[in-house]
């Protein structure tokens, strides 16, 4: 039975230009996390495996830096680059976690954090 | 296993700039975050920032972003640090550390000494 | 930035005596990592996602907490449990460390 709940940074905007941390955290289960996969919408962004490290895709390569923790930073960011962004959590013995963000990069100064959501 | 094995001993004058290396071994140095800490005997352990060999993508912390800079060469899996302007409050042990995963520092390099002299 | 506040900042125990000291977060982070360093030496990972001990770490340590409070215990002092433990977070940027908790021998 899978327990866990994976908490996000939910739904933020950022400035063009500007850099954003993309954050899941997973919680209520002893599950062992063994990779975690960034994607947005289909398009994979990065993988960090236990054993292997993080791999950055290369369409991504230029503007990721991996972390904090086994969050995301996307830098030099454009407004192409609003959209959906899951974190999913392969664990054992649980299975697969997903979760979502919604990222806006707005033109104007004015970019303000969401709250913080839960994903059951 | 992983080990990280940094350059010998520095002392500099005040003002002028120092670059110390971290070269690694055991594991894919393009994979892993690398980052660099200060200790000092008043400070205690200050990060100083990090770098993603695999794009050479830095991030600093405020405090050190004009003080040091991070670079990495994947051909020799070799991490380095330069300081610049030097003064007194720059004398400390700095070390290396991989970046594991979930965020801690599994593997430290054994610390570069900086001593500033004025 | 979110500061760590470690207690305390030095303590004593005899052999064989439960030890325990905090680190409380300035805001709430998701996991804590804990460090240990002997004098002259380089920090070693001892504790890291809140409870996982490194490889090599005696099971008589352990580690627990969520949001502000996290702790490390060690169930029966030893001699060689002597040494200076900092705590760690990188729930955001800038990573911070704790000022650390000296453990002597009594």
């Known amino acids: 039975m899978m327990t866990g709940t994976i908490e996000t940074t939910g739904n933020i905007s950022a400035e063009k230009g500007g850099s954003i941390i993309l954050q899941c955290h997973l919680s209520s289960t002893t599950a062992q996390v063994t990779q975690v996969n960034w994607e947005q919408q289909d398009q994979l962004l990065a993988i960090c495996n236990a054993d292997l490290g993080w791999h950055i895709s290369p369409s991504f390569k230029d503007r990721v830096a991996p972390g904090p923790g086994l969050g995301l930073t996307l830098q030099s960011l454009t407004v192409n680059d609003t959209g959906e962004y899951f974190c999913i959590y392969h664990t054992y013995p649980d299975g697969t976690y997903t979760g979502r963000i919604f990222l806006e990069v707005l033109e104007s100064s004015v970019a303000e954090h969401g709250a913080r959501f839960q994903i059951p | 296993q992983a080990y990280l094995q940094q350059s010998g001993a520095e002392l500099v004058r005040s003002g002028a700039s120092v670059k110390m290396s971290c070269k690694a071994s055991g594991y894919t140095f393009s994979n892993y975050n690398m980052h660099w800490v200060k200790q000092t005997p008043g400070q205690g352990l200050e990060w100083i920032g990090y770098?993603?060999?695999?794009?050479?993508?830095?991030t600093y912390s405020q405090k050190f972003k004009d003080k040091a800079t991070l670079t990495a060469d994947t051909s020799s899996s070799t991490a380095y640090m330069q300081i610049s302007s030097l003064t007194s409050e720059d004398s400390a042990v700095y070390f290396c550390a991989r970046g594991g995963f979930g965020g801690a520092m599994d593997y430290w390099g054994q610390g570069t000494s900086v001593t500033v002299s004025s | 930035q979110i500061v760590l506040t470690q207690s305390p900042e030095i303590m004593s125990a005899s052999p064989g005596e439960k030890v325990t000291m905090t680190c409380s977060a300035s805001s709430s982070v998701s996991h804590m990592h804990w460090y240990q360093q002997k004098s002259g030496t380089s920090p070693k990972r001892w504790i890291y996602?809140?409870?996982k001990l490194a490889s090599g770490v005696p099971a008589r340590f352990s580690g627990s907490g969520s949001g502000t409070s996290y702790s490390l215990t060690i169930s029966s002092m030893e001699a060689e449990d002597s040494a200076t433990y900092f705590c760690?977070?990188?729930?955001?940027?800038?990573?911070?460390f704790g000022a650390g908790t000296k453990l002597e021998l009594k």
């Open positions: 996602d809140t409870s």
């Open positions: 770098i993603f060999p695999g794009n050479g993508v830095t």
């Open positions: 760690q977070q990188w729930n955001n940027n800038p990573l911070t």
